[in-house]
Structure formats: structure tokens, C-alpha cells
Interface confidence: low
């Protein structure tokens, strides 16, 4: 807390400029008018204030706007944003994407801070949904942003926004998140032709059901092993050897290197050894010839 002291003669700030970097904290408090500061916030960012001096400037704005800063001030906070607490930010009403971009720029190159997370939350809630432009902006600054959302939050992403998603944006998503995103991606890309569709949908396939994988196997897509390894185990298990061979195309040879890892390991255990042998890869662990395979899940459904 800065003590209230009178401004020394001749030191009253007429504008926000570099001469203020030489003011002591109490002089800033006494000599800088909060309303002047609010109208000239855009200048603060270009002046090398110390963090301690920024504390004083923040204090002045807090006094002027106890209910939260107006967007005209927020947009020009610049590095002063780093001084804000999540509690400060919860008082704001940020509606402009330009404001959001300006503040994200300040934090660029750093981990997402609690301040940024709160800002994004306020912004998205204010908009009602995660529209394409917002998603474009957020994933540009934070490639992992999508995967930081809960499946419930992801459900508010409209299919049209999926066009903004890049493969790297999904790197840290877990299967539950992909379960939500995949149907949206399928809808978003439904009018594309086969090869183009596969390129776009590939990153989302960790949420694909068996029937969609079967359909893809009929389209000569040549799925790479990295994508195959990210598929849901429960979606892969019902695929036949022939379907997996068609799905992977020339990449089928990669199964050998992955035979001890899920979902390949579990899939092998479900296939007849005879069928696996047709691949000529030396895959072992299939059901021996002459054994009867009972699909217990089917039997439970009937009873």
C-alpha cells in the first residue's frame, strides 16, 4: 500500500511518458492522475517501468475502477496484464477478440498462466461458444489449448470451428476428448472427397468407432502406424485381418514392431492365427487353429 503524499511542485504528470521511470513509487502515486493513466494506457507498454512502479499504476487503476476495468483499458494493459490476479480478471467483461489477442501476446512463449486461463474462460463464456475465430486465436498461442478442455467444455465447440484445428493441437488429447471431437470433425469434413477427407480426419481418429474404421479400410487410405496406434482399442478389436491390411496398406509391415503394444497386442489375441499368417509378418499369439471363438458380448446382448 502506497502512502498518500502531496505531489512535489512541478512534478505533476501532464502525460504518460518516459520521464516517469525516474519517479519514486510515492511520486507516481501522488503525481499521476488515474484518469490520465486510463486514457493513455497504450503508452505504458513502451516505457521501461519497474515491476514495483507497475504495482503503483495498477493500484491507481484499481481505485478508479473498483468494479473491474473497462475494455478500452484492458485492451491496452500490455505488460501490466502480468500484474493482474485471476480475481481481478473475473471482474472483467472482455468481448473483443482483439483485446484477447493483445493480452495473449503479452504472455507469448510462456506456459498458460492462471491469469490467461481465467481470461480465456471469461471470454469464451461471454461468447457462449468456442467459435472458429476464437479457436484459431487460442490454438495459435497455445497449441495444447483444445486438449486442456474437459469433454463437457469441448461439447460447446461447433463443427465449423474444427477447420481451425491443426494436428499438433490434438497431441495431448486423451481418448475421452477425441470421442467428443471426432463426430464434430466427421460432420465438418463430410463433403470432402476420400483422400482429402482422410488427411483432415486423421488426427481425430482416436475417437472413431469400429464402423468408421471399416469404412475407411475400403478407401485405400494407407493409414500410418502412428495413427493406428492411437485408435481406440475397443474400435480396433472387431476389425478382421483383411480390414486391417486394407486400412494400413503398405504400412501393414509395421505391425510386427508394435506386436507387444496396444492396440496391436490385443487385436492379435482376437485373430485366428491362420489369418495372421496370411500377412507373412510372423505375428504370433492368435487363436490356434481348431479353436472355437465364442463372442460372449454377443451372447450377453441376446440373453
Amino acid at each position: 500500500e502506497v502512502e498518500k503524499t502531496a505531489c512535489p511542485s512541478g512534478k505533476k504528470a501532464r502525460e504518460i511518458d518516459e520521464s516517469l521511470i525516474f519517479y519514486k513509487k510515492w511520486e507516481l502515486e501522488a503525481c499521476v492522475d488515474a484518469a490520465l493513466l486510463a486514457t493513455q494506457m497504450d503508452r505504458v507498454n513502451a516505457i521501461p517501468f519497474t515491476y514495483e512502479q507497475l504495482d503503483v499504476l495498477k493500484h491507481k487503476l484499481d481505485e478508479l475502477y473498483p468494479q473491474g476495468y473497462p475494455e478500452s483499458v484492458i485492451q491496452h494493459l500490455g505488460y501490466l496484464f502480468l500484474k493482474m490476479s485471476p480475481e481481478d480478471i473475473r471482474k472483467w467483461n472482455v468481448t473483443s477478440l482483439e483485446t484477447l489477442k493483445a493480452l495473449l501476446e503479452v504472455n507469448k512463449g510462456h506456459e498458460m498462466s492462471p491469469q490467461v486461463a481465467t481470461l480465456i474462460d471469461r471470454f469464451v463464456k461471454g461468447r457462449g461458444q468456442l467459435d472458429k475465430d476464437t479457436l484459431d486465436t487460442l490454438t495459435a498461442f497455445y497449441p495444447g489449448y483444445l486438449c486442456s478442455l474437459s469433454p463437457e467444455e469441448l461439447s460447446s465447440v461447433p463443427p465449423s470451428s474444427i477447420w481451425a484445428v491443426r494436428p499438433q493441437d490434438l497431441d495431448t488429447c486423451d481418448p475421452r476428448q477425441l470421442d467428443v471431437l471426432y463426430p464434430k470433425a466427421r460432420l465438418a469434413f463430410q463433403n470432402m472427397n476420400g483422400s482429402e477427407y482422410f488427411v483432415k480426419i486423421q488426427s481425430f481418429l482416436g475417437g472413431a468407432p469400429t464402423e468408421d474404421l471399416k469404412a475407411l479400410s475400403q478407401q485405400n487410405v494407407s493409414m500410418d502406424l502412428a495413427t493406428f496406434m492411437k485408435l481406440r482399442t475397443d474400435a480396433v478389436l472387431p476389425l478382421t485381418v483383411a480390414e486391417v491390411q486394407k486400412l494400413l496398406g503398405p504400412h501393414v509391415e509395421g505391425l510386427k514392431a508394435e506386436e507387444r503394444h496396444r492396440p496391436v497386442r490385443d487385436w492379435i489375441l482376437r485373430q485366428r492365427q491362420d489369418d495372421l499368417d496370411t500377412l507373412g509378418l510372423g505375428l504370433q499369439g492368435g487363436i490356434p487353429n481348431g479353436y472355437l471363438v465364442l463372442d460372449l458380448s454377443m451372447q450377453e446382448a441376446l440373453s
Epitope: 507498454n45 513502451a46 521501461p48 519497474t50 507497475l54 500490455g78 505488460y79 502480468l82
Partner: nanobody, 120 residues
């Protein structure tokens, strides 16, 4: 590791001169500013002078006209030429560097250990 090492301090009579140096090493780049600060016994650290990447300089009122800040040719050395020294200039002088053009000093800054200047 980033290191800033000051030198050149010492005991000098009032009216005399000293030249402080600050050698910077370990910086991936210098995109911004370097500065000199000082701290007198029992007082807050204060900014004396700063120089930005475009060469523009700033001085505290108390030293303007007497002190000159400059960067060496190698861009990794900072100098402070101090003339007409006064007893009130007695302090520990620190150099600091900020590898970015805008934004607050102390936001992403590096400090040296300081060099002592005593004016009798």
C-alpha cells in the same frame, strides 16, 4: 548461464571520475536494454541510466550531464562514465539487462552482483 559482472568501482574524491564496466556473457541475444542502478546504504535501489537496442539513453535527473552510459562494440559490455562525482553518488552500482524491447524492467531481467563506489 547468464552472467553480468561489474567492475571499476572504488574510492574517489569528490569531483573525480570513475568508469564502471559490466561484462555480459551467456545471453542468447541482446534484443533490448541494459541499465545501471544504484543502492545507497539504507535506501531503495534506483535506476541511474538505461540504454536501449536502438542506442537511445535515459538518465535520472540527479546524474544527467555528469554520467554517460554506453555499450561496447561487442554489444556484450556496458559502461558508465561518471564525472564530477559527489558524495551522494556513494552506492553499490548494479548493471541489469533485459532481453526484450518493450515491457517492464524486472519482467525478464538479469542482475550483476554490484560494484561499490565511495566518493569522499
Amino acid at each position: 548461464d547468464v552472467q553480468l559482472v561489474e567492475s571499476g568501482g572504488g574510492l574517489v574524491q569528490a569531483g573525480g571520475s570513475l568508469r564502471l564496466s559490466c561484462a555480459a556473457s551467456g545471453f542468447p541475444y541482446f534484443s533490448c536494454c541494459m541499465s545501471w542502478h544504484r543502492q545507497a546504504p539504507g535506501k531503495d535501489r534506483e535506476l541511474v541510466s538505461s540504454i536501449s537496442s536502438d542506442g537511445s539513453t535515459h538518465y535520472a535527473d540527479s546524474v544527467r550531464g555528469r554520467f554517460t552510459i554506453s555499450k561496447g562494440n561487442a554489444r556484450n559490455t556496458l559502461y558508465l562514465q561518471m564525472n564530477s562525482l559527489k558524495p551522494e553518488d556513494t552506492a553499490v552500482y548494479f548493471c541489469a539487462a533485459y532481453p526484450r524491447q518493450l515491457g517492464p524492467y524486472y519482467a525478464m531481467d538479469y542482475w550483476g552482483q554490484g560494484t561499490s563506489v565511495t566518493v569522499s
